[in-house]
C-alpha cells in the first residue's frame, strides 16, 4: 500500500458543495475507488470489464460520482463545518496486474464562504 498526499488539487468547491477528485493512472483498466472520511467509507465506485470487454460500473456506497479515463470525482453537498476532516482516495488496481492499493488524501478545510447556507 502506498500512502501520500495528493499532488493535485483534490477539492473543488462550488454552490455550497465540494467535488473531491480521486485520480488514477491512464493505464488502469479495472479498479475500485473508495472515498474515505477519516477511516469511514463514504463512497465507492468499481469499474470492471467482462470477457467481451463490456464495462460494468458499480457502487455499493452510492454518492453522486463522475468517471473519466483518469479520475473519479465524488460530490458532497450541503457543506457544513462537520465536513472538515481528512479525506482519502483509496484506489485498488485490479488491471493491469499486479494488484496494488494506493492511498492519497488531504484535509478539507471549511471556510464561511464555502458553506451552503450562511446566516446573514
Amino acid at each position: 500500500e502506498i500512502n501520500g498526499s495528493a499532488n493535485y488539487e483534490m477539492f473543488i468547491f462550488h454552490n455550497g458543495g465540494v467535488q473531491i477528485l480521486c485520480k488514477y493512472p491512464d493505464i488502469v483498466q479495472q479498479f475500485k475507488m473508495q472515498l474515505l472520511k477519516g477511516g469511514q467509507i463514504l463512497c465507492d465506485l468499481t469499474k470492471t470489464k467482462g470477457s467481451g470487454n463490456k464495462v460494468s460500473i458499480k457502487s455499493l456506497k452510492f454518492c453522486h460520482s463522475q468517471l473519466s479515463n483518469n479520475s473519479v470525482s465524488f460530490f458532497l453537498y450541503n457543506l457544513d463545518r462537520s465536513h472538515a476532516n481528512y479525506y482519502f482516495c483509496n484506489l485498488s488496481i485490479f488491471d493491469p496486474p499486479p494488484f496494488k492499493v494506493t492511498l492519497t488524501g488531504g484535509y478539507l478545510h471549511i471556510y464561511e464562504s464555502q458553506l451552503c447556507c450562511q446566516l446573514k
Partner: antibody
C-alpha cells in the same frame, strides 16, 4: 483455493431443457464476472455466455441467444445456465469459468450435456 | 465476430527443443497499450488453464519456458524447451469485444 463445481448435465431429447449449476467457493463470488464455455467432444472451446458481478449485464454467443439464460445467486455463490430448445449441436462439456479481469483464470471440471433422441 | 486462426494444427517436438505456435486474428486486438489476447493450455481429460494474458504476460505459476509475443493481429506462443508435461492442446483467445472467440487449437506432442 478457488473451486468451481458444475452439475446438472445429462441426456436430454432435442427440444428439451436443462439447468446447469456451478457452485463457487474459495473467493468472493460477487466480485467477479462469470462465464460458461463449452467444448463438443473432440473439438475446441466455444464461449457461451457471461454475467457481471450482480447479474445486471449478460451477454450470449449468437449460437445460443434466445435459447439459453445465464443467471447467478450471490447469496448462494452459484452460477446457473438455463438451456431451452436444445439441439444436437449443443452436445458438449459445459465449463463454468471465472473471468479473472484479463483471462479465464479458474475452471470447473465441466458437466457433460448430451442432446440425443 | 473476430475470427481466430492457429498454425500449425499440430506439431511434434523433441524433448528440450523449442515449440512455436502462431495465432492470427481477423482484426487488430490492440486497444490503448493492451493486446486483448490470451493463451490457454488444455491437457487430456482436464479443463483449460490460463497461461498468458495481454499477449505476453505470464499468469501466476506458469513456468518461464512459456512466453508470448506479438501485437495487432499476429501472435506467437513459444515453449523454449519442451517438457513431457507440456503435451497438450494450446488455444489462443481474444477478449477485444463480444463475442470473445477461441482459435481452433494446436496439439503439441513429443517427437
Amino acid at each position: 483455493e478457488v473451486q468451481l463445481v458444475e452439475s446438472g448435465g445429462g441426456l436430454v431429447q432435442p427440444g428439451g431443457s436443462l439447468r446447469l449449476s456451478c457452485a463457487a467457493s474459495g473467493f468472493t463470488f460477487s466480485d467477479y464476472w462469470m462465464d460458461w464455455v463449452r467444448q463438443a467432444p473432440g473439438k475446441g472451446l466455444v464461449w457461451v455466455s457471461n454475467i457481471d458481478e450482480d447479474g445486471s449485464i449478460t451477454e450470449y454467443s449468437p449460437f445460443v441467444k434466445g435459447r439459453f439464460t445465464i443467471s447467478r445467486d450471490n447469496a448462494k455463490n452459484t452460477l446457473y445456465l438455463q438451456m431451452n430448445s436444445l439441439r444436437a449441436e449443443d452436445t458438449a462439456v459445459y465449463y463454468c469459468t471465472r473471468w479473472g479481469r484479463f483471462g479465464f483464470d479458474s475452471w470447473g471440471q465441466g458437466t457433460l450435456v448430451t442432446v440425443s433422441s | 465476430d473476430i475470427v481466430m486462426t492457429q498454425s500449425p494444427d499440430s506439431l511434434a517436438v523433441s524433448l528440450g527443443e523449442r515449440a512455436t505456435i502462431n495465432c492470427k486474428s481477423s482484426q487488430s486486438l490492440l486497444s490503448g497499450s493492451f493486446n486483448y489476447l490470451t493463451w490457454y493450455q488444455q491437457k487430456p481429460g482436464q479443463p483449460p488453464k490460463l497461461l498468458i494474458f495481454y499477449a505476453s504476460t505470464r499468469h501466476t505459476g506458469v513456468p518461464d519456458r512459456f512466453s508470448g509475443s506479438g501485437s495487432g493481429t499476429d501472435f506467437t506462443l513459444t515453449i523454449s524447451s519442451l517438457q513431457a508435461e507440456d503435451v497438450a492442446v494450446y488455444y489462443c483467445h481474444h477478449h477485444y469485444n463480444a463475442p470473445p472467440t477461441f482459435g481452433p487449437g494446436t496439439k503439441v506432442d513429443i517427437k
